[in-house]
């Protein structure tokens, strides 16, 4: 379970994103260039500092709109 305002790194960060984002998924893999502002951002915020639920949710993917 997610514990608010803590440092999250490695697999624990990935698992927490999966928990928070659920079926929406999240921005995980970098593109072929291996550069991703999103990926770098969540690492800086959540592993090297600490992050809360609201920040984690900003990395969840937006579900495709159904027609």
């Amino acid at each position: 379970a997610y514990r608010p305002s803590e440092t999250l790194c490695g697999g624990e960060l990935v698992d927490t994103l999966q928990f928070v984002c659920g079926d929406r998924g999240f921005y995980f893999s970098r593109p072929a260039s291996r550069v991703s502002r999103r990926s770098r951002g969540i690492v800086e915020e959540c592993c090297f500092r600490s992050c809360d639920l609201a920040l984690l949710e900003t990395y969840c993917a937006t579900p495709a709109k159904s027609e």
């Epitope: 440092t7 999250l8 790194c9 490695g10 697999g11 624990e12 960060l13 990935v14 698992d15 995980f28 893999s29 970098r30 260039s33 291996r34 550069v35 991703s36 990926s39 770098r40 969540i42 690492v43 800086e44 592993c47 090297f48 500092r49």
Partner: antibody
Framework: EVQLLESGGGLVQPGGSLRLSCAAS???????IMWWVRQAPGKGLEWVS?????????LYADSVKGRFTISRDNSKNTLYLQMNSLRAEDTAVYYC???????????????WGQGTMVTVSS | DIQMTQSPSSLSASVGDRVTITCRAS??????LNWYQQKPGKAPKLLIY???TLQSGVPSRFSGSGSGTDFTLTISSLQPEDFATYYC?????????FGQGTKVEIK
């Protein structure tokens, strides 16, 4: 060829300082999280420190916190480890390594340097 | 901190043998377990990450399995170049910790 090359090791007295360098080549250094890992003679591997790709974030093992400082110069493709207040128990081969994943170590360390020996003794 | 315990600490085997090394975590680490091979005087080499994914360029005789707290590295048919020390490492969270190593020696 993707390569990491450490330098700066040597013999230092307890309480002394050393600065290790790790020169990267063959890949876009600024895109990767980087690590220092050490291995005392005849012993296992121990994580020392990690730095984010931009250099804006750092973490340290409790055993070196407050004494060691990790940094990087992306314009020079070089990783550093400043080691102060050295102790006998810091004697080890120090390796730099490249992160294999996206979220700080979750896929291990895929490229390692050859290591540089640090001996702390009077 | 998460403690990693490998067994056995050493083993003797012959070329062609099937070799199994186990690694146990002191708490659940999901599948965030990596395996390295180290030869004397050399740097470690990543073999397997996230428990079962073979690193690029690593021979298919190496395989990994497990989840939670119990993990296994298997060498299906030991080759002369496989005599080395093998380390497991948890990558679930900080501090990133390694097992004490398993030395695979020639019988």
């Amino acid at each position: 060829e993707v390569q990491l090359l450490e330098s700066g090791g040597g013999l230092v007295q307890p309480g002394g300082s050393l600065r290790l360098s790790c020169a990267a080549s063959g890949f876009t250094f600024s895109n990767y999280i980087m690590w220092w890992v050490r291995q005392a003679p005849g012993k296992g591997l121990e994580w020392v420190s990690v730095i984010s790709s931009s250099g804006g974030g750092t973490l340290y093992a409790d055993s070196v916190k407050g004494r060691f400082t990790i940094s990087r110069d992306n314009s020079k493709n070089t990783l550093y480890l400043q080691m102060n207040s050295l102790r006998a128990e810091d004697t080890a081969v120090y390796y730099c390594a490249r992160d294999n994943g996206d979220y700080v170590g979750e896929k291990g360390f895929d490229i390692w340097g050859q290591g540089t020996m640090v001996t702390v003794s009077s | 901190d998460i403690q990693m315990t490998q067994s056995p600490s050493s083993l003797s085997a012959s070329v062609g043998d099937r070799v199994t090394i186990t690694c146990r975590a002191s708490q659940s680490i999901s599948n965030y377990l990596n395996w390295y091979q180290q030869k004397p005087g050399k740097a470690p080499k990543l073999l397997i990450y996230t428990a079962s994914t073979l690193q690029s360029g690593v021979p298919s005789r190496f395989s990994g399995s497990g989840s939670g707290t119990d993990f296994t590295l298997t060498i299906s048919s030991l080759q002369p170049e496989d005599f080395a020390t093998y380390y497991c490492q948890q990558s679930y969270n900080s501090p990133w910790t390694f097992g004490q190593g398993t030395k695979v020696e020639i019988k």
